[in-house]
């Protein structure tokens, strides 16, 4: 008589995660009597996938009725496939006995599961950095299969090259993850800049998946300080201006000191934005010259985004003829940040 054949016609089957997979198996003869079982993997560690007689296999159903007389089709359908279902499945014929004896195995069908990568998540540095410093951004995407994937970084549409990317695990796995780090050198103009992590995979029918991060979350642009004195008023009051320009973020506190004593403290709020995303702020202080016998040392002290305070100081010279003092004089930048206004 002709030897029994267990036929698994497909060498491999690919399926998308979430779909059903059909694994085909037919036998060439009804003899000898005995059950068919499905296993994943071969050898002693193989995993029982389906056995008509016993066990509970909620995701596995026979394609045709196995109880039907003269049934020779033992194909199965596995529903709601996940990457964890990937592997080689064997249809195995047993001879009835106590216990049943393995008689013949099919050649096996390799089930490969295609799974889409998760939306890339981009995270930036924990603390802000200033222009000319390098910051790192990280992009992660998970759960994809097969392993082949491309990841690109862009800053304002231009591809970044200082990038390190790893796909894990290195060996064969049911699904994979990608992690990439891009190093970006900040400039003062980067408040409105954006970095994009772009992930492309065989399963994606659209354009690559994108994750974004705004450099505004990573950058600190320290302010420029300039102090100027307006014209002496008729009532012997000097109007002194502290101009704080081109800073980001908005979190800023300005304190006026007269001869070392706090005169006034202000917090920046609801400032209009410059084109480049930075902010400007101007504070005024009126100094009554006639109330002072000696020179007045004025200090504009700015604390920006929790950083150490920056000071600009100058002296108002109290003269016998205060009305003759100069007007619209900008304090000069000196090594000690001291300004003398005459």
């Amino acid at each position: 008589e002709e030897e029994l054949q267990v036929i698994q016609p497909e060498k491999s089957v690919s399926v998308a995660a979430g779909d059903s997979a059909t694994l085909n198996c037919t036998v060439s003869s009804l003899i000898p009597v005995g059950p068919i079982q499905w296993f994943r993997g071969a050898g002693p560690g193989r995993e029982l996938i389906y056995n008509l007689k016993e066990g509970h296999f909620p995701r596995v159903t026979p394609v045709s009725d196995p109880t039907k007389r003269n049934n020779m089709d033992f194909s199965i359908r596995i529903s709601n496939i996940t990457p964890a279902d990937a592997g080689t499945y064997y249809c195995v014929k047993f001879r009835k006995g106590s216990p049943d004896v393995e008689l013949k195995s099919g050649a096996g069908t390799e089930l490969s599961v295609r799974a889409k990568p998760s939306a890339p998540v981009v995270s930036g540095p924990a603390v802000r950095a200033t222009a000319e410093h390098t910051v790192s951004f990280t992009c992660e995407s998970h759960g994809f299969s097969p392993r082949d994937i491309t990841l690109k970084w862009f800053k304002n549409g231009n591809e970044l090259s200082d990038v390190q990317t790893n796909v894990d695990p290195a060996g064969k796995s049911v699904s994979y993850s990608i992690r990439s780090t891009a190093r970006v050198v900040l400039t003062r103009r980067d408040v409105h800049s954006q970095v994009i992590c772009e992930v492309a995979h065989v399963t994606l029918q659209g354009d690559p998946l994108r994750g974004t991060a705004n450099l505004s979350e990573a950058i600190r642009v320290p302010p420029f300080l300039e102090v100027t004195q307006q014209s002496m008023r008729a009532d012997n009051q000097v109007n002194v201006t502290c101009q704080v320009t081109k800073f980001y973020p908005q979190r800023l506190q300005l304190t006026w000191l007269e001869n070392g004593n706090v005169s006034r403290t202000e917090m920046a709020s609801a400032l209009p934005e410059n084109k480049d995303g930075t902010y400007n702020w101007t504070s005024w202080l009126l100094v009554n010259v006639s109330a002072h016998r000696d020179d007045v040392k004025l200090t504009c002290q700015v604390e920006h985004d929790g950083q150490p305070a920056v000071n600009k100081s100058f002296s108002v010279k109290v003269s016998a003829h205060p009305k003759e003092q100069g007007s619209n004089t900008a304090a000069e930048n000196t090594g000690t940040n001291e300004r003398n206004i005459y």
Partner: antibody
Framework: QSVEESGGRLGTPGTPLTLTCTVS????????MGWFRQAPGKGLEYIGI?????SPYYASWVNGRFTISKTSTTMDLKMNSPTTEDTATYFC?????????????WGPGTLVTVSL | DIVMTQTPSSVEAAVGGTVTIKCQAG??????LAWYQQKPGQRPKLLIY???TLESGVPSRFKGSGSGTDYTLTISDLESADAATYYC???????????FGGGTEVVVK
Amino acid sequence: QSVEESGGRLGTPGTPLTLTCTVSGFSLSSYVMGWFRQAPGKGLEYIGIISSSGSPYYASWVNGRFTISKTSTTMDLKMNSPTTEDTATYFCARVGPLGVDYFNIWGPGTLVTVSL
Amino acid sequence: DIVMTQTPSSVEAAVGGTVTIKCQAGQSINSYLAWYQQKPGQRPKLLIYYASTLESGVPSRFKGSGSGTDYTLTISDLESADAATYYCQSWHYISRSYAFGGGTEVVVK
């Protein structure tokens, strides 16, 4: 599920020509679609694809000779300045449901003849 | 672009026989290889994708194998209906571009 090309005709060199691919049974917003051509007696040649979101990508040799676009139900291939070398049967095709690495639904093709 | 070299350009075999067609990629394509059958005046028909996965409805006489740069299509138990031209097609996951082999004409005696 099917796709069908139309618009093939006899054209003259330099005169733009537009081919249309009409799909039925599935949505163009869910699949990548491709254009291919086959010169008489020659093999298949890839021209370009358009993603589900409408972004076109072209073979490196195209160099602006073709433009791929789409509406909700059709995909177009515009031959910007055809030459006699563009005489071929043009096919549109849809990628498989599992990925963009293969094409499982092809149209019957439409013949374009460019001659003086 | 990746160049796909398909051999032979033509092959003849008898009904019931076996035909082997080879396709070599200019660089690794990580099993992203499909095989198509095209008969004169007809559209291409997908047979196999991902190097070895049989498209639904395609007889198991068609077998695909290979990895890296070298791939093979084997047609066994040849039938007269198998007379056609066969093309391999690659997809490169980095450039995201496609390329076809030159085709193999199969003549069934």
